[in-house]
């Protein structure tokens, strides 16, 4: 990895739990200031593998609301607008980091957690296993 | 929102910056322990809107490595294996949370940051603007 010289102005880290427990500023810096939030908002309907978005809420998690995609059809929409079952709609998934309140119900203490979310769907050629 | 009774065993939060600055345990809890990491590993090749994965590394960020998807073609692969430019391959994007070292180069102090990542690609019908 890349070794970076430590900044002398860093907060004190003499905590016995260091480096497992760190300080995190929750004032979110958004790097996407010039992006249009509606950019991909209609892909879920225009895709050949359209999806529905389901709200997943958990007050013990930060962010508390995550939207999960579920493919609308098993197959994919063809040029005629019909579902073609020779193809499969599949979810595109990503592991993301969230903060889980730990101990539970604590406002200022969290643990990093990795969860798998479905972001949208794509159309793939199915894997067909032929019997000998 | 849902009001949750505070746990009396929570860490002390008399910090003047509370609740902006919180304690986070970096021992990641993985909720996907029984998931197969190879599950969607070949979708990028089997999709009608295939994509390439590019490594984005930043030692000042946690996680330091993020994989970005870039659609391989402008159009989508048709049944004959050719690119059909009547359709568009588009990236499915998601805003995710990462930790940014702040001040820079500090091992135990971070700020939450929201970044936009492309997870994969899907095939959509293009929006055609007709001229009057």
């Amino acid at each position: 990895g890349i070794t970076i010289p430590r900044n002398p102005g860093c907060p004190n880290s003499e905590d016995k739990n260091f480096p497992r427990t760190v300080m995190v500023n929750l004032n979110i810096h958004n790097r996407n200031t010039n992006t249009n939030p509606k950019r991909s908002s209609d892909y879920y309907n225009r895709s050949t593998s359209p999806w529905n978005l389901h709200r997943n809420e958990d007050p013990e998690r930060y962010p508390s609301v995550i939207w999960e995609a579920k493919c609308r059809h098993l197959g994919c929409i063809n040029a005629d607008g019909n579902v073609d079952y020779h193809m499969n709609s599949v979810p595109i998934q990503q592991e993301i980091l969230v903060l889980r309140r730990e101990p539970p119900h604590c406002p200022n203490s969290f643990r990093l957690e990795k969860i798998l979310v479905s972001v949208g769907c794509t159309c793939v050629t199915p894997i067909v296993h032929h019997v000998a | 929102g849902i009001t949750i009774p505070r746990n009396p065993g929570c860490p002390n939060s008399e910090d003047k910056n509370f609740p902006r600055t919180v304690m986070v345990n970096l021992n990641i809890h993985n909720r996907n322990t029984n998931t197969n990491p190879k599950r969607s590993s070949d979708y990028y090749n089997r999709s009608t809107s295939p994509w390439n994965l590019h490594r984005n590394e930043d030692p000042e960020r946690y996680p330091s490595v993020i994989w970005e998807a870039k659609c391989r073609h402008l159009g989508c692969i048709n049944a004959d294996g050719n690119v059909d430019y009547h359709m568009n391959s588009v990236p499915i994007q998601q805003e995710i949370l990462v930790l940014r070292r702040e001040p820079p180069h500090c091992p135990n102090s971070f700020r939450l940051e929201k970044i936009l990542v492309s997870v994969g690609c899907t095939c959509v019908t293009p929006i055609v603007h007709h001229v009057a």
């Epitope: 997943n56 579920k70 098993l74 197959g75 579902v83 073609d84 709609s89 894997i127 | 998931t35």
Partner: antibody, heavy 118, light 108 residues
Framework: QVTLKESGGGLIQPGGSLRLSCATS????????MSWVRQAPGKGLEWVSI???????YYADSVKGRFTISRDNSKNTLSLQMNSLRAEDTAVYYC????????????WGQGTLVTVSS | SYELTQPPSVSVSPGQTATITCSGD??????ASWYQQRPGQSPVLVMR???QRPSGIPERFSGSNSGNTATLTISGTQVMDEADYYC???????????FGPGTKLTVL
Amino acid sequence: QVTLKESGGGLIQPGGSLRLSCATSGFTVSSNHMSWVRQAPGKGLEWVSIIYSDGTTYYADSVKGRFTISRDNSKNTLSLQMNSLRAEDTAVYYCARGRYSGWYFDYWGQGTLVTVSS
Amino acid sequence: SYELTQPPSVSVSPGQTATITCSGDDLGSKYASWYQQRPGQSPVLVMRQDDQRPSGIPERFSGSNSGNTATLTISGTQVMDEADYYCQTWDHGTSKYVFGPGTKLTVL
């Protein structure tokens, strides 16, 4: 009203063949996904095969190469041709209708019992 | 191959809430459906696509699905709800339908 009724079950020797039929009314077979699901005595449900509205067919690994699903659009019926039958194929066979999305089966027949035994 | 796991049996008293779970690898990314099968009868769809109740199914039946677990909840359970319950989904990886092993609900 939607109805499905299976027929063709019975006692058959191992290695033999049998053809199951599913007569339907109240809907068009060719516009829906039609499936066969079986249930061995005292056991749970096991999916066997499906023919989608576009004619695409899929089979469970346990029957692939031995069973063939088909539909007769003119008679609005579903069939399952079962060859090289084994003792483990003994079950009640249900035909079921799948809806547009394909994710679930909304109507089931009353089932027909197939017994494979010597 | 994809597998679903259900508890073999669940017991409740009349009027109580029965909760039947169905677990599978990242089941929340798929739609789960539930079927009720009374002894000697054909299966009946009681919940489709996670939380959609078909017409004719009482409001006491509800469903949810996220993470690795789908849940069928029967509030104010009645003696007539005593039956086997099967969860079902479709596996993207194999293009096959999958049923859970079933849960026997006993209303004491």
